[in-house]
């Protein structure tokens, strides 16, 4: 069967939104009116993997590139890359698990928990205009929180 | 400050071999697509090649496909470029840029000349 | 092979407003290609002026903008100077097949 997909956006806690700055940059900053165009939509694919009933298992690819998010050790850092694929194998089912995020939802906000790196999630920052990144700290300064909003197709 | 540091460039003979190191500092690294661009002596600028932050994607300019190498060690804040089998026309001045477009601010830059 | 065309040459009045654009040899310039503009003076590490089709770099007058305009790259200088006699180069992303970035040739603008 094929996997099942759903179109959206994310805006972190302080509704900043995600865009890219280049091929291979996502970036979080506040956007308003028309620039709201420049936000990324995602295709969220629903992949298997370790599942209860707040955390479910997706990956999430850019809508209409073949570009995932993925989680690698880097140099001995859990490093967040944005990874080109062959469009013709993705997105699958089994999805390998450095594409694999746990989305888990707490009190109407979604984290997005590496299932390669456990407790390393996806993070942006409190200052405008810096990348998106794979963070070990909850609750800190950094942001780990996200909205979702559904696009339509 | 965001600084970019250039080194490794010299005299080489065609056929021979080099690898370049850009030190960075003043930001964080590890989050930053980078690229390589350079310029022959009284030419243009050219993009040489370009790495994600994982090191998972890069990209090459034709001219130089399957003989440089993009790579980057995010422990050492540092960006390389391996560049075998070098002709006389790779003479040029090699800058690191912040991510893959290459943005503000450039290094200096180091001079690599092959010749016999 | 796809190539980035630039006007070899401009020249502007002081206080003038110029345009230079940036094409594809086949195709039309999107965001998608992520549009980059660069100057450069001799002698001098090149400064890149605007990124991402209208994002300015730090510290870079309002007086330089980015667009599309039609099928191209745009570089609009508003209220030329003296000091923005240079070579202005842009750059395109060239889609993930190809995985690159290429430059333009350069414009070499003049101000009289």
């Known amino acids: 069967a094929p996997v099942r997909s759903l179109n959206c956006t994310l805006r972190d806690s302080q509704q900043k939104s995600l865009v890219m700055s280049g091929p291979y940059e996502l970036k979080a900053l506040h956007l308003q009116g028309q620039d709201m165009e420049q936000q990324v939509v995602f295709s969220m694919s629903f992949v298997q993997g370790e599942e209860s009933n707040d955390k479910i298992p997706v990956a999430l690819g850019l809508k209409e590139k073949n570009l995932y998010l993925s989680c690698v050790l880097k140099d001995d850092k859990p490093t967040l890359q944005l990874e080109s694929v062959d469009p013709k194998n993705y997105p699958k089912k089994k999805m390998e698990k450095r594409f694999v995020f746990n989305k888990i939802e707490i009190n109407n906000k979604l984290e997005f928990e590496s299932a390669q790196f456990p407790n390393w999630y996806i993070s942006t920052s409190q200052a405008e205009n810096m990348p998106v990144f794979l963070g070990g700290t909850k609750g800190g300064q950094d942001i780990t929180d996200f909205t979702m909003q559904f696009v339509s197709s | 400050e965001v600084q970019l540091l250039e080194s490794g460039g010299g005299l080489v003979q065609p056929g021979g071999s080099l690898r370049l190191s850009c030190a960075a500092s003043g930001f964080t690294f590890s989050t930053y697509a980078m690229s390589w661009v350079r310029q022959a002596p009284g030419k243009g600028l050219e993009w040489v090649s370009g790495?994600?932050?994982?090191?998972?994607?890069?990209g090459y300019a034709d001219s130089v496909k399957g003989r440089f190498t993009i790579s980057r060690d995010n422990s050492k804040n540092t960006l390389y470029l391996q560049m075998n089998s070098l002709r006389a026309e790779d003479t040029a001045v090699y800058y690191c840029a912040k991510d893959w477009m290459a943005t503000t601010p450039w290094g200096q830059g180091t001079l690599v000349t092959v010749s016999s | 092979q796809t190539v980035v065309t630039q006007e070899p040459s401009f020249s502007v009045s002081p206080g003038g407003t110029v345009t230079l654009t940036c094409g594809l040899s086949?195709?039309?310039?999107?965001?998608?290609?992520?549009p980059g503009w660069y100057q450069q003076t001799p002698g001098q590490a090149p400064r890149t002026l605007i990124y991402n089709t209208n994002n300015r770099s730090s510290g870079v007058p309002d007086r330089f903008s980015g667009s599309i305009l039609g099928n191209k790259a745009a570089l609009t200088i508003t209220g030329a100077q003296a000091d923005d006699e240079s070579d202005y180069y842009c750059?395109?992303?060239?889609?993930?097949?190809?995985?690159?970035?290429?430059f333009g040739g350069g414009t070499k603008l003049t101000v009289l």
């Open positions: 086949s195709g039309s310039v999107t965001t998608n290609n992520y």
């Open positions: 750059a395109l992303y060239m889609s993930s097949g190809s995985n690159n970035a290429v």
């Open positions: 790495i994600n932050t994982g090191g998972g994607s890069t």
